[in-house]
């Protein structure tokens, strides 16, 4: 499977909400016998490889984040990370998934990357990722709501394999 | 779901020795995986941590002697030039520690013992 | 971070109620993360408290915790025998040198 980012930039005014999106491209798998993990963190665009660094979003690591279901369920991040920090993580049974970050400051522009990691029990795994950038402006040039801009088909598959 | 720490042995001083943990049951892309040490009769000491494809971090006196590596399923620590302050049962666990969901994400192993002795 | 634990030992009668004090050098990250770990001998430490006051499954109400920031404390309240045991606060300051440090311990004997 790929990860696909349909965005590649997010442009926000401040105190606005924003959700960043990626999604599976397939096959993907729906047996009984694949997990899928998915989650979310902020990068720096590395020289060597993108998304490799993985610092906290809104002082939640990938680790807090991370959201687990076999390949049938949808899965959300619990109501205590919407309320404390403003953040929703969530997955449907498309493959679609998406953070959701309310109240944009600018401390919240940079890089943001998706993983999602894929187990096949007794098997081993296969890890993909996706990266998109948030800008959030302020002042009289910001837009007056957020404005995406689509990634470039090359771009928007772009697989990173473990 | 489980994580044990195996390589655990009675060395000489000046000895490297790599320790082994092996986890399952979950995946190492996911979470913090950390080294945690108690010499015998003492406190706890962290070693370090690292998380899949990202830089290890160590504490100020374990720089340079101790590394921490990982594969798909195992994390290493490698330890230069033992002394016998080294001896203590060393740890593997999951996550950074002070895990915000520590119900589910903190695991740890039984500990295997090294001693360093001449 | 250095994080500095009051104090290292503490006898106390079955029944009462034990504090213990966990003093940071630098806030944890976010505030919050800092864990209570309970040690018995032979046995890994076994998660109390985590995120400063949320209790870990299992783990009975007698025990709490409190604090942010810099300061945090571990309550322990009608001390029963088998409370007797090492216990460790846990820090984390984020991803660097030092990013992570337990107290010293406090034992508890229980009378």
């Known amino acids: 499977f790929k990860v696909a980012t349909p965005y590649s930039l997010y442009v926000c005014p401040e105190g606005q909400n924003v959700t960043l999106t990626c999604r599976l491209l397939g096959p993907v798998d729906k047996g009984h016998d694949v997990t899928f993990y998915k989650t979310w963190y902020r990068s720096s665009r590395g020289e060597v490889q993108t998304c490799s660094e993985r610092r906290p979003i809104r002082n939640l690591t990938f680790q807090d984040l991370h959201l687990h279901h076999g390949g049938h369920q949808a899965a959300n991040t619990s109501h205590d990370l919407a309320q404390r920090h403003g953040l929703e993580s969530a997955s449907d049974h498309h493959g679609n998934f998406s953070i959701t970050m309310r109240n944009l400051t600018l401390l919240d522009s940079g890089l943001y990357c998706c993983l999602v990691v894929e187990i096949r029990h007794h098997h081993s795994e296969h890890r993909v990722h996706g990266a998109m950038e948030l800008q959030v402006q302020t002042g009289k040039d910001a837009p007056s709501n957020c404005v995406v801009y689509p990634s470039s088909s090359q771009d928007s598959e772009n697989i990173t394999a473990a | 779901q489980s994580v044990e720490e195996s390589g655990g042995r009675l060395v000489t001083p000046g000895t490297t020795l790599t320790l082994t943990c092996t986890v399952s049951g979950f995946s190492l892309s996911l979470y913090y995986m950390s080294w945690v040490r108690q010499a015998p009769g003492k406190g706890l000491e962290w070693i370090g941590m690292t998380y899949t494809g990202g830089s290890a971090y160590y504490a100020s006196w374990a720089k340079g002697r101790f590394t921490i590596s990982q594969t798909s399923t195992t994390v290493d620590l490698k330890m230069t030039t033992l002394t016998v302050a080294d001896t203590a049962t060393y740890f593997c666990?999951?996550?950074?520690?002070?895990?915000?969901?520590?119900?589910?994400?903190?695991?740890w192993g039984p500990g295997t013992l090294v001693t360093v002795s001449s | 971070i250095v994080m500095t634990q009051t104090p290292s030992s503490k006898s106390v009668p079955v029944g009462d109620t034990v504090t213990i004090n966990c003093q940071a050098s630098?806030?944890?990250?976010?505030?919050?993360?800092l864990a209570w770990y309970q040690q018995k001998p032979g046995q890994p430490p076994k998660l109390l408290i985590y995120r400063a006051s949320n209790l870990a499954s299992g783990v009975p109400s007698r025990f709490s915790g409190s604090g942010s920031g810099t300061q945090f404390t571990l309550t322990i309240n009608d001390v029963v025998c088998d409370d007797a045991a090492t216990y460790y606060c846990a820090g984390y300051k984020g991803d660097s040198t030092d990013g992570v440090a337990f107290g010293g311990g406090t034992e508890v004997v229980v009378k």
């Open positions: 630098e806030s944890v990250f976010s505030d919050d993360r």
């Open positions: 666990v999951r996550g950074y520690l002070a895990d915000y969901y520590g119900d589910r994400d903190n695991l």
